[in-house]
């Protein structure tokens, strides 16, 4: 009786239960009642990931500089190439096809995380007791001066994007 | 490269044997099932006898079941052909061949024997 | 036992003609595994068509075959002068036994 389901690793074909491919080459021809299932490896641009019946590899993914890619991980005959972006880009989806600048934090906002190879930088408002004056892709809010520390009062008080400013204690008052 | 080459034929009387060999190289011989093929002289293929890449299954054309015994030695790349009780009609050129899905895609040069009293 | 019938027996054409040549099953030949083997004076055959249409490896696009179930076709577009040869089919899907056609010998008319 032909089977009508086949074993993990296998598969179906013309009633006969056949071995898949191993993960790093193709298929080049199914099993018989005689033959074990024909593969061939991978050449050295090409790879396959899974155990399958694939009669092609598929060709690594190309890391193009032209697009701020550059290389993270080779690729084998059972993995496919990994790309990441250039320091100061980051990569605009999951399969990172190509780059883009990294976002810098207005004034007022501060790097809440800094951005990665696939990831951007994220920003946090500065909360009160924190500024931020510049537009940055590393600065985190810093907090106001303490102008107690210093003997001195404020002058001028803060905000999310400016330093207090202090001054001398009004000496007629004492 | 792939090959396969065929040895043992000659010249033998009726009711003698004679032992074929066919070794191979240029591919993973354990993975392939094998045949015998032969052609008597000015005549086309007859298909002779199968066996499986691990040994355990072998099938016969009926006009040599129970005389001849296909084998094979995958420690050596070879197949064999154990021909006894040899017949006249027997006389043919012997070609070993691989099996595959696509049909027998590599054959031997072949190995004349020739049943004469 | 599927019986391959070849015809015709002989066919003579002279180079750059079209070849036909006919395979005929006694009964259907599952899943068209059949194939096509050319075969010179003197040599081994060699595997030309295989699952009815696909060409083997190395073989010139000159050489194509078609058909299925029973009635199967090798054609040879512009016969090349090494093309004259004997060409056999077999069916190696419905075994045992495998069986080969009779075999159809392409001349030089």
């Known amino acids: 009786e032909p089977p009508t389901a086949c074993r993990e690793k296998q598969y179906l074909i013309n009633s006969q239960c056949c071995s898949l491919c191993q993960p790093g080459q193709k298929l080049v021809s199914d099993c018989t009642e005689f033959t074990e299932t024909e593969c061939l490896p991978c050449s050295e641009s090409e790879f396959l990931d899974t155990w399958n019946r694939e009669t092609r590899c598929h060709q690594h993914k190309y890391c193009d500089p032209n697009l701020g890619l550059q290389v993270q991980q080779k690729g084998t005959s059972e993995t496919d190439t990994i790309c990441t972006c250039e320091e100061g880009l980051h990569c605009t989806s999951e399969s990172c096809e190509s780059c883009v600048p990294h976002r810098s934090c207005l004034p007022g906002f501060g790097v809440k995380q800094i951005a990665t190879g696939v990831s951007d930088t994220i920003c946090e408002p500065c909360p009160v007791g924190f500024f931020s004056n510049v537009s940055s892709a590393f600065e985190k809010c810093r907090p106001w001066t303490s102008c107690e520390t210093k003997d001195l009062v404020v002058q001028q008080a803060g905000t999310n994007k400016t330093d207090v400013v202090c001054g001398p204690q009004d000496r007629q008052r004492a | 490269q792939v090959q396969l080459v065929e040895s043992g034929g000659g010249v033998v009387q009726p009711g003698r044997s004679l032992r074929l060999s066919c070794a191979a190289s240029g591919f993973t011989f354990e993975k392939y099932g094998m045949h015998w093929v032969r052609q008597a002289p000015g005549k086309g293929l007859e298909w002779v006898a199968v066996?499986?890449?691990?040994?355990?299954?072998?099938y016969y054309a009926d006009s040599v079941k129970g005389r001849f015994t296909i084998s094979r030695d995958n420690s050596k790349n070879t197949l064999y052909l154990q021909m006894n009780s040899l017949r006249a009609e027997d006389t043919a050129v012997y070609y070993c061949?691989?099996?595959?899905?696509?049909?027998?895609?590599?054959w031997g040069q072949g190995t004349m024997v020739t049943v004469s009293s | 036992e599927i019986v391959l019938t070849q015809s015709p027996g002989t066919l003579s054409l002279s180079p750059g003609e079209r070849a036909t040549l006919s395979c005929r099953a006694s009964q259907s030949v599952s899943y068209s595994y059949l194939a096509w083997y050319q075969q010179k004076p003197g040599q081994a055959p060699r595997l030309l068509i295989y699952g009815a249409s696909s060409r083997a490896n190395g073989i010139p696009d000159r050489f194509s075959g078609s058909g299925s179930g029973t009635d199967f076709t090798l054609t040879i577009s512009r016969l090349e002068p090494e093309d004259f040869a004997v060409y056999y089919c077999?069916?190696?899907?419905?075994?045992?036994?495998?069986?080969f056609g009779g075999g159809t010998k392409v001349e030089i008319k």
């Open positions: 077999s069916d190696y899907a419905d075994y045992p036994p495998f069986t």
């Open positions: 066996i499986s890449y691990e040994g355990e299954k072998k």
């Open positions: 061949a691989r099996d595959t899905s696509r049909g027998h895609d590599i």
